[in-house]
């Protein structure tokens, strides 16, 4: 059985409206039905109606149809408000433009292209013809209106009233010529109801053939009238769901208006230094996401293919690789130059209503003189003059007292990661302040990353490791347990401190965590004699974007044959390329019968430039990252290894040079791994160990 087409899409709906006939000669037909769709089908087919149906009203209260041979534009008729009524008018009778060849045109134009009045179809004067209304039922050969009953090239036409000119086409524009939009058509409220390939659009208030979330009542400001093309979601141009079950949606062919200006109401407030609202009007030059990964150019398709191009979004200022919000997202964002991270928010751009005087710093912020006096966790800063003793304890020069006024965020110790302050909270003696580096400030904090200037090893004679690695050589390896299961790795860098990754702490309740030390088996089998189980007493989050955490143990680990600490590298050091390193972890191995034993993968250090090339130039590494490639294809860190160390040896001394963090994929063949560069954060680690109180053993 052939499925009857749903014809309600051919009608324009006016909610809470009915038509009242002033002319008593006008006919009406009524019948009880269940849905407006049933009314529409009967109106379109004129089944059982003594007239050509041009409109109908659905009475929702009485479940009744009222079919009309007229519409709201007809004489002898007036519109009236009525809660229970919905008026549906056949678009063909109210449209003043044509679709394709204009076969369905039923408008009232009755003058030809050259201005001659049309001859009525029922008349044989001045031209005899066979196009009688009775022979072309449904083609609406009424009065002397232009029509195209056979769908011929050239569009609607008529026989003319001029005996010298038999017939001529009428000058009725294509709907795609009449309709136009500004920008990407987000404010378009026109009547285009078919796609660029000619498919009829699905009504927004219908869920067939395609289910969707854009319900008119849910989005009253999006103009979801009937089945007209709209752009509710920041696409390049208006679109609609189609009536073709095999084509979910398609763009509509709506040209850009000649005078391409936006209405005043559509223009977001433009800002360059901060974000107003969701930042749709942000026009500044920040071009990295929150964690420092550079943005991809909007006019580039590498490393990420997309359609958010300057051509598609003409009014969104998609210049260069600046953070923008062209699609109504939460805040400005961009595609990133990291192939593994498609997009990221530029959440480091401050909100306009959160400005605190000078709210950005240059370099490392040692000259910052703004008046912010709150840490990133919301603690109020304490006065500098109350903390001078503590400050002297970890810097070896006299701080500039003239800069340390009140309790403002400052950087008296040349911290690489920006202004900070003391808090007066004994658990958190100090913390960084929520200030970003100024836009366009590219001053590096460490120079010459790929040239070994500073050795990473503290001394050449510290510790000698003979022969092949044994269990005792991995005593610094920590299994972080979350609700009794292994979740991440970590490195014991001091008796009370474990270095790991920020993402390893899904819960804020420290009772949910334990640290297991001295084990080789992830379940602790056979490790009973050597295993130490320690609670976690505090998490100290690394500088913004570092992805590092220092986890403080509730009591110090006991160093023995099975538990040992691992050394940190010198701040800002570089390890030579091709240095052999290892990553350790109890994570996913790719094996079905995983035995739970600590695994090691051997990697070698790769310079940042070469690493970028291995990632096909799609990744630009910054000074806080280190790269190491696998000796064996497909080996490297994966889930469960996060937080664990990249361990390298220099001058016979083993150090933790990197930390495994999510977001770089699992052991991808021919793609070197990218780790957090511990040397970049070494000063921060030392400062925490020096200033945070730990329990005595």
């Amino acid at each position: 059985q052939r499925k009857r087409r749903n014809t309600i899409h051919e009608f324009k709906k006016s909610a809470k409206t009915t038509l009242i006939k002033i002319d008593p000669a006008l006919k009406i037909k009524t019948k009880k039905v269940n849905t407006a769709d049933q009314c529409a089908n009967r109106c379109t087919r004129n089944k059982g109606l003594p007239f050509t149906c041009k409109a109908f009203v659905f009475d929702k209260a009485r479940k009744q149809c009222l079919w009309f041979p007229f519409n709201s534009m007809s004489s002898g008729v007036k519109k009236e408000f009525g809660h229970e009524f919905d008026l549906y008018e056949n678009k063909d009778y109210i449209r003043n433009c044509i679709i394709g060849k204009g076969r369905s045109y039923k408008g009232t134009v009755s003058i030809t292209k050259s201005g001659i009045k049309c001859q009525p179809w029922s008349s044989m004067i001045p031209h005899e013809h066979s196009f009688l209304p009775s022979s072309y039922r449904g083609k609406d050969l009424q009065e002397n209106y232009c029509r195209n009953p056979r769908g011929e090239e050239g569009g609607p036409w008529c026989f003319t009233s001029n005996p010298e000119v038999r017939y001529e086409v009428c000058d009725i524009p294509q709907c795609s010529e009449v309709e136009c939009m500004t920008c990407n058509g987000e404010s378009y409220r026109g009547l285009m109801d078919h796609t660029e390939s000619g498919k009829i659009c699905q009504r927004w208030d219908h869920q067939t053939p395609h289910r969707h979330k854009f319900l008119p009542e849910r989005y009253p400001d999006k103009g979801f009238d009937d089945n007209y093309c709209r752009n509710p979601d920041g696409q390049p141009r208006p679109w609609c769901y189609t009536l073709d079950p095999h084509t979910r949606w398609e763009y509509c062919a709506i040209k850009t208006c000649a005078d391409n200006t936006m209405n005043d109401t559509d223009v977001p407030l433009e800002t360059t230094e901060c974000i107003q609202g969701q930042g749709e009007g942000y026009r500044g030059t920040v071009n990295t996401i929150w964690n420092g990964i550079p943005c991809q150019r909007w006019d580039s398709q590498y490393p990420h293919e997309h359609d958010m191009t300057p051509e598609n979004f003409k009014c969104k200022d998609l210049r260069e690789n600046y953070c923008r919000n062209p699609d109504g997202s939460e805040s400005p964002w961009c595609f990133t130059t990291d192939p593994n991270i498609r997009v990221g928010y530029c959440s480091q751009i401050p909100n306009c209503d959160m400005s605190h005087g000078q709210d950005c710093y240059r370099g490392n912020g040692k000259n910052y003189m703004g008046n912010l006096s709150q840490t990133r966790s919301g603690l109020t800063c304490s006065m500098w003059d109350k903390n001078m003793e503590d400050l002297h304890r970890h810097i070896f020069w006299e701080p500039d007292a003239s800069k340390l006024n009140e309790n403002y965020c400052r950087n008296p110790d040349d911290d690489a990661h920006g202004p900070w302050c003391y808090t007066g909270n004994p658990l958190i003696p100090w913390d960084y302040c929520p200030i970003s580096r100024c836009e366009g400030d590219t001053t590096p904090t460490i120079v010459n990353l790929d040239h070994p200037v500073i050795s990473c090893a503290k001394t050449k004679q510290l510790r000698v490791v003979n022969g092949i690695p044994t269990r005792t050589n991995i005593g610094w390896m920590v299994s972080l347990r979350y609700r009794n299961k292994h979740i991440c790795g970590g490195s014991l860098i001091k008796e009370s401190w474990v270095l790991t990754a920020r993402q390893c702490f899904p819960s804020r309740d420290l009772k949910d965590y334990e640290a297991w030390l001295g084990i080789h088996d992830v379940h602790g089998r056979g490790d009973e004699k050597c295993k130490q189980v320690l609670n976690v007493s505090q998490l100290v989050y690394g500088p913004e974007g570092s992805d590092l955490v220092l986890m403080k143990l509730a009591r110090p680990a006991v160093l023995d044959d099975f538990v040992s600490t691992i050394d940190l590298p010198n701040y800002g050091c570089t390890i030579p390329e091709k240095t052999s390193c290892s990553v350790y972890g109890w994570g996913y191995t790719g094996l079905i019968n995983y035995d739970g034993l600590l695994r090691v993968a051997h990697l070698y250090i790769m310079g940042n430039e070469k690493c970028s090339q291995h990632h096909r130039g799609k990744v630009t590494l910054n000074e806080s990252e280190i790269c190491a490639g696998a000796e064996k294809i497909g080996s490297g860190p994966c889930e469960g290894d996060y937080g664990g160390p990249l361990v390298c040896e220099q001058h016979k001394m083993r150090m933790v040079l990197g930390v495994i963090v999510p977001g770089r994929g699992c052991a991808i063949p021919n793609r070197p791994g990218i780790f957090v560069r511990v040397a970049y954060y070494a000063k921060w680690i030392h400062k925490i160990i020096l200033t945070y109180k730990v329990p005595q053993s």
Partner: antibody
Framework: VEESGGRLVMPGTPLTLTCTVS????????ISWVRQAPEKGLEWIGV?????VTDYASWAQGRFTISKTSTTVDLKIPSPTTEDTATYFC?????????????WGPGTLVTVSS | AYDMTQTPASVEVAVGGTVTIKCQAS??????LAWYQQKPGQPPKLLIY???KLASGVPSRFSGSGSGTQFTLTISGVECADAATYYC????????????FGGGTEVVVK
């Protein structure tokens, strides 16, 4: 985020719902599943964190399984019962761990009936 | 377990009035609490996070307060558009949690 896979199933027929994400990365944000039975309140089911670890509500443990790929998060219901009839939402968690939900999908309806 | 109890289950308020909804945690969750608004047929919408911070685009007539175990959502100068169900959610820990959400409060605007 957008959910898919909701449909009418018989009790005991396994069902998998999929949450497809775009505009952000699953290596930056956790994803949570929440359901709402007709005319009832929100009921948290579980969460998958950035590091791949999952947590479930105590009643949902063993009844549901959450897993992910690079752009999708699946909720498997191995043996649905009529009590599992609900609209299922996936929501983006503000951070890599447990936090508030700052982006919700429109929901997908699951009807379990014989 | 960190379970949430929300009161009242339903409240009626006149346009322009003030409505207060309370949420109690079974143990301290510091300031890790969020509030959501849900209208029929729609997904929930984030209103407030970290107990008192207003989410982007939320009108200032909504405010949140509290810490530890007691939290309050206040809607001042209620508008017709505020008719909805409101839910609290703890963002602290999900260990042994039955439901991270409170039971919901229906706000009826007269």
């Amino acid at each position: 985020v957008e959910e898919s896979g909701g449909r009418l199933v018989m009790p005991g027929t396994p069902l998998t719902l999929t949450c497809t994400v775009s505009g952000f990365s699953l290596s930056s944000n956790a994803i949570s599943w929440v359901r709402q039975a007709p005319e009832k309140g929100l009921e948290w089911i579980g969460v998958i964190y950035v590091i791949g670890v999952t947590d479930y509500a105590s009643w949902a443990q063993g009844r549901f399984t959450i897993s992910k790929t690079s752009t999708t998060v699946d909720l498997k219901i191995p043996s649905p019962t009529t009590e599992d009839t609900a609209t299922y939402f996936c929501a983006r968690v503000y951070d890599s761990g447990w936090n508030h939900f700052n982006l919700w999908g429109p929901g997908t309806l699951v009807t379990v009936s014989s | 377990a960190y379970d949430m109890t929300q009161t009242p289950a339903s409240v009626e308020v006149a346009v322009g009035g003030t409505v207060t909804i309370k949420c109690q945690a079974s143990q301290s969750i510091s300031s890790w609490l969020a509030w959501y608004q849900q209208k029929p047929g729609q997904p929930p919408k984030l209103l407030i996070y970290e107990a008192s911070k207003l989410a982007s685009g939320v009108p200032s007539r909504f405010s949140g307060s509290g810490s530890g175990t007691q939290f309050t959502l206040t809607i001042s100068g209620v508008e017709c558009a505020d008719a909805a169900t409101y839910y609290c959610q703890q963002a602290y820990s999900v260990a042994n949690v039955d439901n991270a959400f409170g039971g919901g409060t229906e706000v009826v605007v007269k």
